[in-house]
């Protein structure tokens, strides 16, 4: 009796179970009652990453330098090319089809997490006792200067954007 279902890595055609083509190969011809499935390797710049019965291999992704992309990992017959972004840029999506410039953290905000090729800068507001007076993709919030440790007193209070201003203590006459 002809099968109605096949084992893993097989497919049903013409009432028989045929082996799927291995990753890196495409289907040329179904198996016959005499012979196994006929498969051929994917060409240069093509891939198939699963056991399959595909009649065409997929094209490797192109990392377009005009979009700020570069090759992170070259594709093989079994894997796609992995793109990443040039220094100072990050991917706009998980698929990394284009890049945007890393965001800078404005004064009053510091860098919580430095950007990578796939994630943007994460900024955080400087809490009390910390400040940032620059727009930067790298600078964290800096702690206010401790006037006391310098034997000075606070002459001007700090904000999230400015450091405290220290001055000499008033001498008792």
């Amino acid at each position: 009796e002809p099968p109605t279902a096949c084992r893993e890595k097989q497919y049903l055609i013409n009432s028989q179970c045929c082996s799927l083509c291995q990753p890196g190969q495409k289907l040329v011809s179904d198996c016959t009652e005499f012979t196994e499935t006929e498969c051929l390797p994917c060409g240069e710049s093509e891939f198939l990453d699963t056991w399959n019965r595909e009649t065409h291999c997929h094209q490797h992704k192109y990392c377009d330098p005009n979009l700020g992309l570069r090759v992170q990992q070259k594709g093989t017959s079994e894997t796609d090319t992995i793109c990443t972004c040039e220094e100072g840029w990050h991917c706009t999506s998980e698929a990394c089809e284009s890049c945007v410039l890393h965001r800078s953290c404005s004064p009053g905000f510091g860098v919580k997490q430095i950007a990578t090729g796939v994630s943007d800068t994460i900024c955080e507001p400087c809490p009390v006792g910390f400040f940032s007076n620059v727009s930067s993709a790298f600078e964290k919030c800096h702690p206010w200067t401790s006037c006391e440790t310098k034997d000075l007193v606070v002459q001007q209070a700090g904000t999230n954007k400015t450091d405290v201003v220290c001055g000499p203590q008033d001498r008792l006459r």
């Epitope: 289907l27 040329v28 179904d30 051929l40 009649t55």
Partner: antibody, heavy 116, light 111 residues
């Protein structure tokens, strides 16, 4: 059961044209590459051409490039070979075969004779 | 697209083993394990007897075996029988996505 039934052979003058057909049955024609192989009288086998499942890839032996065209009609389960600018050296038995590079099934063959 | 090289003829006595060689290049036999062997009796279509270098189609006698070393493939027929008398052709897929056949070998069973 798998069957490949050929037609279209015959006598043709040098420079003439002919179209060979191969009607397939007993298998899923549209998921298989198909090929043509020829054999001159008293000579060996010579691979001529093959075509992928949807006709987007076609390959030919150098000696027939630009003169012969392989094609298929998946709706009709048929394979074709258009032979143009025929030469005496194209005289041969022409076989259609199922597959891209190995052939478990062959047509019965059709004789093409190029002679004036 | 040069034909693969086979000896024109090979002969042996019944019960003997014979080997038919098939020599190609790096860009066909050397680079691919897509070598097939066909048997052809006079007036008949070829019959596939070995594929993918050493696989035997079901129903083909296990007296036929195939192998490959470098750019040369071989077909061995053991326990030679009268019905083995035929022409034998090797073929290989090539780097230019084409197929090439050998010139053919006439196997004669003596006696």
């Amino acid at each position: 059961q798998v069957q490949l039934v050929q037609s279209g052979g015959g006598l043709v003058q040098p420079g003439g044209s002919l179209r060979l057909s191969c009607a397939a049955s007993g298998f899923t024609f549209s998921s298989n590459w198909m090929s043509w192989v020829r054999q001159a009288p008293g000579k060996g086998l010579e691979w001529v051409a093959n075509i992928n499942q949807d006709g987007s890839e076609k390959y030919y032996v150098d000696s027939v490039k630009g003169r012969f065209t392989i094609s298929r009609d998946n709706a009709k389960n048929s394979l074709y070979l258009q032979l143009n600018s025929l030469r005496a050296e194209d005289t041969a038995e022409y076989y259609c075969a199922r597959g891209g590079y190995r052939y478990a099934y062959w047509g019965q063959g059709t004789l093409v004779t190029v002679s004036s | 697209q040069s034909a693969l090289t086979q000896p024109a003829s090979v002969s042996g006595s019944p019960g003997q083993s014979i080997t038919v060689s098939c020599t190609g290049t790096r860009s066909d036999i050397g680079d691919y394990n897509y070598v097939s062997w066909y048997q052809q009796h006079p007036g008949k279509a070829p019959k596939l007897i070995i594929y993918d270098v050493s696989s035997r189609p079901s129903g083909v006698s296990n007296r036929y075996s195939g192998s490959k070393s470098g750019n040369t493939a071989s077909l061995t027929i053991s326990g030679l029988q009268a019905e083995d008398e035929a022409d034998y052709y090797c073929s290989s897929y090539t780097s230019s996505s084409t197929l090439v056949f050998g010139g053919g070998t006439k196997v004669t069973v003596l006696g």
